[in-house]
Interface confidence: low
């Protein structure tokens, strides 16, 4: 229904706390370089304005769209051009072009220092002095580094952060309490960030239809007892919500997400038997719980999929009369029977089925032609199953760090032109798939592995798109979203690459490495490994093992030495010489 004042409507629906959080996220995602203090000033101005509109919807400017109000605020920032260059050109445009322009300037890899967590005592002091400001900083810092983070979910993580600090800051050993809990929140949030970026990529590149297909498959797996009409309704709503968030309509997105949670909880009987525990929670937790809900039990009496989609003589007629709905039912029926498949795989199967019908329904004897389609699915199913098997075996053998290194070598060989920091980040994330998925029960492994890898590879594509350097990466990234992972898996050593010349300074290290946290140490070593592969793309596994083992020993030895600097200065060149020799 239409409201006189959109901003008053959202303020009333969301409440002041969530309204302010979402406005802060929106501004931080659009203008990623602005300091917190500047954004919070704008947030307060917008909030005060919203309150005047709640009091009187006919007050001046209250009838303006939220994009207009937000855009006007951003464009009024002094020195916008100095800080943001051509983003300031957006301000010359009218809505909706202005908002589109802002969206195009979102930077997936902003030049910001890594988010450093303050030391436990300092954190607790600032949290206890001003919890609102502390959590506001959290929202700001995460949102500006992840300009597509799903805003209502970020509010949920801020709530979690709040819970952890409230609990741990009263403990005697604050650090022991905080570190594992905040690490867990961070890990979940980082995965959420790449997953949401993938959803926005899907929406941006392939439109709502592609996203809705993804949603139908996912919902059908989770709610196999729901009827297709119900699944379609949920998928349509989820598509709308994600479109809003990806498009910067964060207030509407969060409001609609809360509405969907309400609808699901009011209609549990027709959706799933597993929802009740979620429905007792407050709004942010309820939505998050529903988004992570376990699959309902598959109905016992489902007939074979072949009856309707292969054996039926009317398949072509049904397909011709309503292609999208017919394919939607196929996707629904197949997905509800296969919670053990990844959504990417289910969409590939639906695509294969569609291609088969397109071909066969134009032939003389369609049933004979499409009669073997389910058997033709077999290689498509086997490929990701083998991927999971071989990678999980390798992970079990090497552990997370070793597995990351194996992936790093593999991907540096596939795309040696890609910058080393991007390759290291991608390999570290891809390597985490082992810890995340390989320990799960067999039936959950494939969906976990493939859908996670797809999201990480989407991040690689997004970064590569900014500065394209590898034709192979461009080719894999330009194709359909569901074909990306198989495309990357199929890449081999890039024979066209001219190896990088050996630069001693790339492999020169100093005593500062000794005081780095373990994670940073690993990144230094992995950076060296990627550079080695760029120098010798065809180096054998044994050669790389020898060099990296030698390197690890060198770091260990010099970090234990009395005169660290001297050790690095004298032993370093010897290491470089030995490495060159080993790789010759």
């Amino acid at each position: 229904e239409a409201h006189k004042s959109e901003i008053a409507h959202r303020f009333k629906d969301l409440g002041e706390q969530h309204f302010k959080g979402l406005v802060l996220i929106a501004f931080s995602q659009y203008l990623q370089k602005c300091p917190y203090e500047e954004h919070i000033k704008l947030v307060q101005e917008v909030t005060d304005f919203a309150k005047t509109c709640v009091a009187d919807e006919n007050a001046e400017n209250c009838d303006k769209s939220i994009h207009t109000l937000f855009g006007d605020k951003l464009c009024a920032i002094p020195k916008l051009r100095d800080n943001y260059g051509e983003l300031a050109d957006c301000c010359a445009k009218q809505e909706p072009e202005r908002n589109e322009c802002f969206l195009q300037h979102k930077d997936d890899n902003p030049n910001l220092p890594p988010f450093q967590r303050p030391e436990a005592e300092a954190m607790c002091t600032s949290f206890q002095e001003n919890p609102t400001s502390f959590l506001g900083h959290y929202l700001h810092e995460v949102a500006r580094r992840h300009p597509y983070f799903y805003a209502p979910e970020l509010l949920y993580y801020a709530e979690k952060y709040n819970e952890v600090l409230t609990q741990c800051c009263t403990e005697s050993d604050k650090a022991a309490c905080l570190t594992p809990k905040l690490d867990a929140v961070k890990e979940k949030a980082l995965v959420a960030a790449v997953r949401q970026r993938m959803k926005c990529s899907s929406m941006q590149r392939f439109g709502e239809r592609a996203f809705k297909a993804w949603a139908v498959a996912r919902m059908s797996q989770r709610f196999p007892n729901a009827e297709f009409a119900e699944i379609t309704k949920l998928a349509t709503d989820v598509t709308k919500i994600n479109k809003e968030c990806c498009h910067g309509d964060l207030l509407e997105c969060a409001d609609d997400r809360a509405e969907l949670a309400k609808y699901m909880c009011e209609n549990q009987a027709t959706i799933s038997s597993k929802l009740q525990a979620c429905c007792d929670k407050p709004v942010l937790q309820k939505s998050q719980c529903l988004a992570e809900i376990e699959h309902d039990n598959i109905p016992a009496d489902l007939p074979s999929i072949a009856a309707d989609f292969v054996e039926d003589k009317e398949v072509c007629k049904n397909y011709a009369e309503a292609k999208d709905v017919f394919l939607g039912t196929f996707l629904y029926e197949y997905s509800r029977r296969h919670p053990d498949y990844s959504v990417s795989l289910l969409l590939r199967l639906a695509k294969k089925y569609e291609a088969t019908l397109e071909k066969c329904c134009a032939e003389g004897d369609p049933p004979a032609c499409y009669g073997t389609v389910l058997a033709e699915f077999q290689p498509l199913v086997e490929e990701p199953k083998n991927l999971v098997k071989t990678n999980c075996e390798l992970y079990e053998k090497l552990g997370e760090y070793g597995f990351q290194n194996a992936v790093l070598v593999r991907y540096t060989q596939k795309a040696p032109q890609v910058s080393t920091p991007t390759l290291v980040e991608a390999a570290r994330n891809l390597g985490r798939v082992g810890t995340k998925c390989c320990t799960l029960p067999e039936a959950q492994r494939l969906p976990c592995v493939e859908d996670y890898l797809s999201a990480i590879l989407n991040r690689l594509c997004v970064l590569h798109e900014k500065t394209p350097v590898s034709e192979k990466v461009t080719k894999c990234c330009s194709g359909s979203l569901v074909e990306r992972r198989p495309c990357f898996s199929a890449l081999t050593v890039d024979e066209t690459y001219v190896p990088k010349e050996f630069k001693a300074e790339t492999f020169t290290f100093h005593s500062d490495i000794c005081t780095l946290p373990d994670k940073e140490k690993q990144i230094k070593k992995q950076t060296a490994l990627a550079e080695l592969v760029k120098h010798k793309p065809k180096a054998t596994e044994d050669q790389l093992k020898t060099v990296m083992g030698d390197f690890a020993q060198f770091v260990d030895k010099c970090c234990k030495a009395a005169d660290k600097d001297n050790c690095f200065a004298t032993e370093g060149p010897n290491l470089v010489a030995r490495s060159k020799e080993a790789l010759a």
């Epitope: 297709f228 009409a229 119900e230 379609t232 009856a307 039926d312 009317e314 009369e321 709905v325 017919f326």
Partner: nanobody
Framework: EVQLLESGGGLVQPGGSLRLSCAAS????????VAWFRQAPGKGREFVAG????????YYADSVKGRFTISRDNSKNTLYLQMNSLRPEDTAVYYC???????????????????WGQGTLVTVSS
């Protein structure tokens, strides 16, 4: 569980019209794919027309296209079959069948419909 009850059959002259109704209970009719079938004496059950669940996409047998119209009234939870230009070969017992969880009539095979009404007789004769 879905219960179906047909009504509206009767004797009609060739060229005449009839409107059959199928009242459903136990489930909302718009959530289920529903269809009309007919069975002439000594013959198998034959698909006449169907409508999808949750999506108003209709299907017709070639022999009735342009003459029969299937529709439903969700508020009354009832399925209808408007039959015009009736012919003697339309004489049969008409049944409605339901397939819960099916958005489309992806099959015109009677065996795939788990729920049936008891049928209503339509006789077309001068």
């Amino acid at each position: 569980e879905v219960q179906l009850l047909e009504s509206g059959g009767g004797l009609v002259q060739p060229g005449g019209s009839l409107r059959l109704s199928c009242a459903a209970s136990g489930r909302y009719i718009d959530e289920t794919a529903v269809a009309w079938f007919r069975q002439a004496p000594g013959k198998g059950r034959e698909f006449v027309a169907g409508i999808g669940g949750g999506v108003d996409i209709t299907y017709y047998a070639d022999s009735v296209k342009g003459r029969f119209t299937i529709s439903r009234d969700n508020s009354k939870n009832t399925l209808y079959l408007q039959m015009n230009s009736l012919r003697p070969e339309d004489t049969a017992v008409y049944y409605c069948g339901a397939r819960p969880g099916r958005p489309l009539i992806t099959s015109k095979v009677a065996d795939l419909y788990p729920y049936w009404g008891q049928g209503t007789l339509v006789t077309v004769s001068s």
